[in-house]
Interface confidence: medium
C-alpha cells in the first residue's frame, strides 16, 4: 500500500495548529470498517492517535491530536496537532492497513519568531569618546536557535568581543543574549541582527552613541597649539598634561592615547598601570612623570606614516581631551644636476637641465633661477615620487635655449623643515662639455 | 545621475606602484563608503578594502595590507586606491563601488566602469 | 575568511529553462548579495540581502536561503541573462565573493 506524506518537513509556529499531512489511494468498495490507522512518533513509537475498528480512538498524544473523519474515506489520514510546542518537533509516522500495510514519517519542524532586540548599553550615563562600554542585544521566545550578527553604522561587521548566550525557558523557547564590548570613538552606530534559521526571519535593533564633549570646568588638558614636527628615523615627544589636584594617584587614572581620525589605540594606562603600547611597539609613557600630571607620549622611530592627528584623552574623576598633531619630515639631499646634450654645446642650441633631490618629506617646492637671481618660470617640469617609506624623490626638468654664458640653478625647499639644497650648473659661451673635462 | 568615474589605463613596471582615482558625482560622497575590487583575467572578484571619505577610515583586506593605500579627498569628492610593488599577477582591471544600504543590510549599487592596470616588464 | 563556494563553475541552458546557482559559505552569514556581470562590463546588483530584487531587475530572478546555503534562481531563462553569476558576503572580514558561474545560452 502506498503512503504518502510530504517530504519536506511542516514548519509550524508555536502555539498554532499543524497539519501533518499523510494519504492513501483507497481500492474501489473500500469502507472505514476495514481500515487501520495509526500515527505514532517515529523515535519513541509512542502512540500519538489511532483509528481501527470503524472507529475513531482518539488522541493519546495530550489530547491535541484529532483526525479529519470527513476525509477519512477519500484516503486523508492527515493528523492535526493543536497548540504546537517546541516539544512536539520531531518524526511522525503514519501507519496505514487495509488488506495491504503502508507507512511513512513526516517531520514536524518548530518555530517561533524572535522579537524586536531590545539595547542596553553599560555604562549609559557620561559618557566619553575612549570609555569601554557593553551594548547587550536581547531577543526573546524565539525557536529554534538564533544567529546573531552586529555591524557598525557603515555594514562593517563586529567579530571581535562578542559574547553570545542563548538560554531555553520552561516551553523551551530561547532568549538570546549578545554583548558587545567596545571603545567608544566620537560617535558610532551598532547593529545587531537576530535571525531565525527557521523562519528565515531577521529581528534586528540598533543603537547610536554620541560622546559627550568635554565639558568645561573639566580635566584641563594641554597640548601644544602647534604641531609637533619630527624627523623621519628619530623619535617625537607628543606633549600633553594635566592639572591633578592634591592627593591624586595613579589608581585614580585612565589615560588614553588614540588616533583622532580612526580612533585606533596608541597606547593606554589603566587600572594603575601602564597597559602597553597598541602601535607597533614603538611607544612608550614616561611613567616617573605621570603623577605629576606628565601624560606625553613618547614615539620612537618616526615613520611617515605616523603623521596626522593624536588625541590624548586624561580621565580622573572628570574628563579631558585635546589632540596633538604630528608633522614628520626628512630633508632633502643636495640636488644633483644633470645636462642633456652634455657635449659640444654652443649659444644657441636647446638643452634640458634636471635638478635631482632624494629622499625628503614632505613634498618640495622648486625653484628655479639664473645666474643673477631671476626666475626661471617657462619650460619647466617637476614630478615627485614617494618612495615605499612614503619619503620623496623630486625631479625637476628646465628646458632652456643657451646664451652666450649663463648660470642656472636649482633650489629645493622643504616647507616643513624651512630647509633649502641648491644645486647649479653654469654653462660658458665656448664649445664645451659637461661636466668639464680635467 | 549617480556615477564613479575611474581614471584611464595603466601599464606599468614590476616593482612600481598605481594610484587609481574614482569621481564620484550625483550623491553626497561622505554619505557612503567606497570599496575597491579586482579582477584579474577570466577570474572572479577580489575585496581590496574600503575608505569612509567622512571619517577617513580605512580597512584592507589583509592580503593586500602592506601594499595597498586608500584616500579620499572631499573638495574633489574622489577617491584613490595605490598599490605599491607591482607584480605582474596584480594585472587586473580595478574597480571602485559604492556600499549602499541601510542597516542592517548593505550591497554594491553602483560600480566604476574599471580600470585596466597592466604590470609588465 | 568565509570562503563562499558557487555551483556550478559552468552551465550551458537553453532559452526559458529554470535555472538554480547555489552558494554555500564555510560558516554562517547574516545575508547574502548577488550580482551579474556581463563580457566587458562592471558586475552590477542583482539581489540585495538574500530575497529582495534590486531596482530594474526582472521579476524572473529571485534569491532564498540562509545560515550558509542560498540560492539564486532564474525562471525562464532569456538570452540577455548570459552572464557570470556572484554571490557576495561582508558578515565577518575580509569581504568575500563566490568564485563565479558563467552561464551560457544554447
Known amino acids: 500500500l502506498e503512503v504518502q506524506v510530504p517530504e519536506d518537513p511542516v514548519v509550524a509556529l508555536v502555539g498554532t495548529d499543524a497539519t501533518l499531512r499523510c494519504s492513501f489511494s483507497p481500492e474501489p468498495g473500500f469502507s472505514l470498517a476495514q481500515l487501520n490507522l495509526i500515527w505514532q512518533l517515529t523515535d519513541t513509537k509512542q502512540l500519538v492517535h489511532s483509528f481501527t475498528e470503524g472507529r475513531d480512538q482518539g488522541s493519546a498524544y495530550a489530547n491535541r491530536t484529532a483526525l479529519f473523519l470527513d476525509l477519512l474515506a477519500q484516503g486523508n489520514a492527515s493528523l492535526r496537532l493543536q497548540r504546537v510546542r517546541v516539544a512536539d518537533e520531531g518524526s511522525f509516522t503514519c501507519f496505514v492497513s487495509i488488506r495491504d500495510f503502508g507507512s511513512a514519517a513526516v517531520s514536524l519542524q518548530v518555530a517561533a519568531p524572535y522579537s524586536k532586540p531590545s539595547m542596553t548599553l553599560e555604562p549609559n550615563k557620561d559618557l566619553r569618546p575612549g570609555d569601554t562600554v557593553t551594548i547587550t542585544c536581547s531577543s526573546y521566545r524565539g525557536y529554534p536557535e538564533a544567529e546573531v550578527f552586529w555591524q557598525d553604522g557603515q555594514g562593517a561587521p563586529l567579530t571581535g568581543n562578542v559574547t553570545t548566550s542563548q538560554m531555553a525557558n520552561e516551553q523551551g523557547l530561547f532568549d538570546v543574549h549578545s554583548v558587545l564590548r567596545v571603545v567608544l570613538g566620537a560617535n558610532g552606530t551598532y547593529s545587531c541582527l537576530v535571525r531565525n534559521p527557521v523562519l528565515q526571519q531577521d529581528a534586528h535593533g540598533s543603537i547610536t552613541i554620541t560622546p559627550q564633549r568635554s565639558p568645561t570646568g573639566a580635566v584641563e588638558v594641554q597640548v601644544p597649539e602647534d604641531p609637533v614636527v619630527a624627523l623621519v628615523g628619530t623619535d617625537a615627544t607628543l606633549r600633553c598634561s594635566f592639572s591633578p589636584e592634591p592627593g591624586f594617584s595613579l589608581a585614580q587614572l585612565n589615560l588614553i592615547w588614540q588616533l583622532t581620525d580612526t580612533k585606533q589605540l596608541v597606547h593606554s594606562f589603566t587600572e594603575g598601570r601602564d597597559q602597553g603600547s597598541a602601535y607597533a611597539n614603538r611607544t612608550a609613557l614616561f611613567l616617573d612623570l605621570l603623577a605629576q600630571g606628565n601624560a606625553s607620549l613618547r614615539l620612537q622611530r618616526v615613520r611617515v606614516a605616523d603623521e596626522g592627528s593624536f588625541t590624548c584623552f586624561v580621565s580622573i574623576r572628570d574628563f579631558g581631551s585635546a589632540a596633538v598633531s604630528l608633522q614628520v619630515a626628512a630633508p632633502y639631499s643636495k640636488p644633483s644636476m644633470t645636462l642633456e646634450p652634455n657635449k659640444d654645446l654652443r649659444p644657441g642650441d636647446t638643452v634640458t637641465i634636471t635638478c635631482s633631490s632624494y629622499r625628503g618629506y614632505p613634498e618640495a617646492e622648486v625653484f628655479w633661477q639664473d645666474g643673477q637671481g631671476a626666475p626661471l618660470t617657462g619650460n619647466v617640469t617637476t614630478s615627485q615620487m614617494a618612495n615605499e617609506q612614503g619619503l620623496f624623490d623630486v625631479h625637476s626638468v628646465l628646458r632652456v635655449v643657451l646664451g652666450a654664458n649663463g648660470t642656472y640653478s636649482c633650489l629645493v625647499r622643504n616647507p616643513v623643515l624651512q630647509q633649502d639644497a641648491h644645486g647649479s650648473v653654469t654653462i660658458t659661451g665656448q664649445p664645451m662639455t659637461f661636466p668639464p673635462e680635467a | 545621475e549617480v556615477q564613479l568615474v575611474q581614471s584611464g589605463a595603466e601599464v606599468k613596471k614590476p616593482g612600481s606602484s598605481v594610484k587609481v582615482s574614482c569621481k564620484a558625482s550625483g550623491y553626497s560622497f561622505t554619505s557612503y563608503t567606497i570599496h575597491w575590487v579586482r579582477q584579474a583575467p577570466g577570474q572572479g572578484l577580489e575585496w581590496m578594502g574600503y575608505?569612509?571619505?567622512?571619517?577617513?577610515?580605512?580597512d584592507y583586506n589583509q592580503k593586500f595590507k602592506d601594499r595597498v593605500t586608500i584616500t579620499a579627498d572631499k573638495s574633489t569628492s574622489t577617491a584613490y586606491m595605490e598599490l605599491s610593488s607591482l607584480r605582474s599577477e596584480d594585472t587586473a582591471v580595478y574597480y571602485c563601488?559604492?556600499?549602499?544600504?541601510?542597516?542592517?543590510?548593505?550591497?554594491?549599487?553602483?560600480w566604476g566602469q574599471g580600470t585596466t592596470v597592466t604590470v609588465s616588464s | 575568511e568565509i570562503v563562499l563556494t558557487q555551483s556550478p563553475d559552468f552551465q550551458s541552458v537553453t532559452p526559458k529553462e529554470k535555472v538554480t546557482i547555489t552558494c554555500r559559505a564555510s560558516?554562517?552569514?547574516?545575508?547574502m548579495n548577488w550580482y551579474q556581470q556581463k563580457p566587458d562590463q562592471s558586475p552590477k546588483l542583482l539581489i540585495k540581502?538574500?530575497?529582495n530584487l534590486a531596482s530594474g531587475v526582472p521579476s524572473r530572478f529571485s534569491g532564498s536561503g540562509s545560515g550558509t546555503d542560498f540560492t539564486l534562481t532564474i525562471n525562464s531563462l532569456e538570452a540577455e541573462d548570459a552572464a557570470t553569476y556572484y554571490c557576495q558576503q561582508w558578515s565577518s572580514n575580509p569581504l568575500t565573493f563566490g568564485q563565479g558561474t558563467k552561464l551560457e545560452i544554447k
Open positions: 575608505i569612509n571619505p567622512n571619517s577617513r577610515n580605512t
Open positions: 563601488a559604492r556600499y549602499s544600504g541601510s542597516t542592517p543590510y548593505w550591497y554594491f549599487d553602483v
Open positions: 540581502a538574500t530575497s
Open positions: 560558516s554562517s552569514v547574516s545575508y
